[in-house]
């Protein structure tokens, strides 16, 4: 008698489960070679493909660059070869692995291709305030395709100290509810830190003039 | 800020060679590709060759690739271009350049190369 | 090798014109085209890279576009200082290749 394969206790057959996949957020850089990590288990072997902002893709296919594939895997590395490379990958990439029990699919994971950190010359002109008033200091950081972060130092490389009245909003500006004196300083500077790169790039320094108004002198 | 700043340039004779240098600072060096692009006097652009600071990998424009030779040496954060078997033609100003993804987004201040024959 | 051609080698113009320069493919470069500002005995800057995007720090009166073999920059209104030689450059297949230039001047 011949027991059909999915009977036999050592070959039930199993659906596509993913066991391994890249992070949702993939950044590389021009020199990065690209890698994508697609593993799943299931019986019998799974197939697996691959789309790009929901187009076949096929790495190998690709023209131009040396594609390593692993066996038995969804995972693949694209090696870049010039300097031009790393932006055409850019896109949403979703792995699907199948077998004849159904499909299991990846994550969606955003590939982004970061350029060279860039802020822009500026002749930075002197803020200029009264004693009470609110003020916002602008930090405007470069943009960046992973997440930075974001800190305000004078030029002796201090922090500035932060409290209920100087706080740094989400956009990295740094947001004075009311200005005194004390805060009159020509050295606020905002630093981006990006740590995929361990960069710091840092912004020019703004000049911050505290004008004492008379009714501040008065209720001196 | 990203600076690159050239040195190695001058005067050599038909069939000698010459090292061009080009250090880099302000941005970390092995995320981002080097180039070489060169004019000559009262001519275009044109690109000689281009390096992987992370991996070495090279490519060249094919009309040098027997004379010029890109590298780099990560320690120093410095590009070069040994240039061998010179001619009169490749008198031109030498840029280094650092490729952003898309373009060549910073450039050095350029380096006169003037071969005598 | 992909020949970058454009077709005109100075162009005068005024300050506050509108200035548009063209750039020709030899075939098709999928946008990736860039354009460089060169002033004498300078080295030349990126002012727009991928047709359209504007290189950090330079002014908005820049401006590319185009797709295919066909790309133009435009400059809406000239400022003294935006007299210079422009390049355009493709960088979608080895070897990149830039166009000849073309000079703007000073009517």
């Known amino acids: 008698i011949q027991i059909p394969e999915e009977y036999e206790g050592h070959h039930v057959m199993e659906p596509p489960v993913i066991t391994e996949q890249s992070p949702r957020r993939l950044v590389v850089f021009p020199t990065d070679d690209i890698s994508l990590k697609c593993e799943a288990s299931g019986k019998p072997e799974v197939q697996f493909r691959w789309t790009r902002d929901g187009v076949h893709f096929k790495p190998k296919e690709e023209l131009g660059v040396t594609v390593y594939q692993s066996p038995h895997s969804g995972s693949f590395t694209i090696t870049g070869n010039n300097s031009n490379f790393a932006q055409r990958f850019q896109g949403i990439y979703r792995c699907f692995a199948s077998n004849k029990l159904g499909t299991a699919m990846s994550h969606e994971i955003r590939l982004m291709a970061e350029g060279a950190p860039k802020w822009p010359k500026e002749t930075v002109k002197p803020v200029e305030v009264e004693e009470g008033e609110s003020v916002v200091l602008p930090c405007n950081p470069p943009p960046s395709a992973e997440p930075l972060r974001i800190y305000w130092m004078n030029s002796k490389i201090l922090h500035i100290k932060q409290d209920e009245r100087v706080t740094m909003g989400q956009n990295g500006n740094l947001y004075f509810a009311n200005v005194l004196t004390s805060d009159n300083h020509s050295d606020y500077i905002c630093h981006a830190h990006f740590p995929g790169t361990r960069t710091i790039i840092q912004k020019e320094p703004i000049d911050l003039r505290v004008k004492a108004t008379n009714s501040m002198i008065d209720r001196k | 800020e990203v600076q690159l700043v050239q040195s190695g340039g001058g005067l050599v004779q038909s069939g000698g060679s010459l090292r061009l240098s080009c250090r880099a600072s302000?941005?970390?060096?092995?995320?981002?590709?080097m180039l070489w692009v060169r004019q000559r006097p009262g001519k275009g652009l044109e690109w000689v060759a281009e390096?992987?600071?992370?991996?070495?990998?090279?490519n060249y424009n094919e009309k040098f690739k027997t004379r010029f030779t890109i590298s780099v040496d990560r320690s120093k954060n410095t590009l070069y271009l040994q240039m061998d078997s010179l001619r009169a033609e490749d008198t031109a100003v030498y840029f280094c350049?650092?490729?952003?993804?898309?373009?060549?987004?910073?450039w050095g201040q350029g380096t006169l190369v003037t071969v005598s024959s | 090798d992909i020949q970058m051609t454009q077709s005109f080698s100075s162009l005068s113009a005024s300050v506050g014109d509108r200035v548009t320069i063209t750039c020709r493919a030899s075939?098709?470069?999928?946008?990736?085209l860039n354009w460089y500002q060169q002033k004498p005995g300078k080295a030349p800057k990126l002012l727009i890279y991928?047709?359209?995007r504007l290189h950090s720090g330079v002014p908005s009166r820049f401006s590319g576009s185009g797709s295919g073999t066909d790309y133009t920059l435009t400059i809406s209104s000239l400022q003294p200082e935006d007299f210079a030689t422009y390049f355009c450059?493709?960088?979608?297949?080895?070897?990149?290749?830039f166009g000849g230039g073309t000079k703007l001047e000073i009517k």
């Open positions: 390096i992987n600071p992370r991996n070495d990998r090279t």
């Open positions: 450059q493709q960088g979608n297949t080895l070897p990149w290749t």
């Open positions: 302000g941005y970390t060096f092995t995320r981002y590709w």
């Open positions: 350049a650092l490729g952003g993804g898309y373009a060549m987004d910073y």
């Open positions: 075939q098709d470069i999928s946008n990736y």
């Open positions: 991928y047709t359209s």
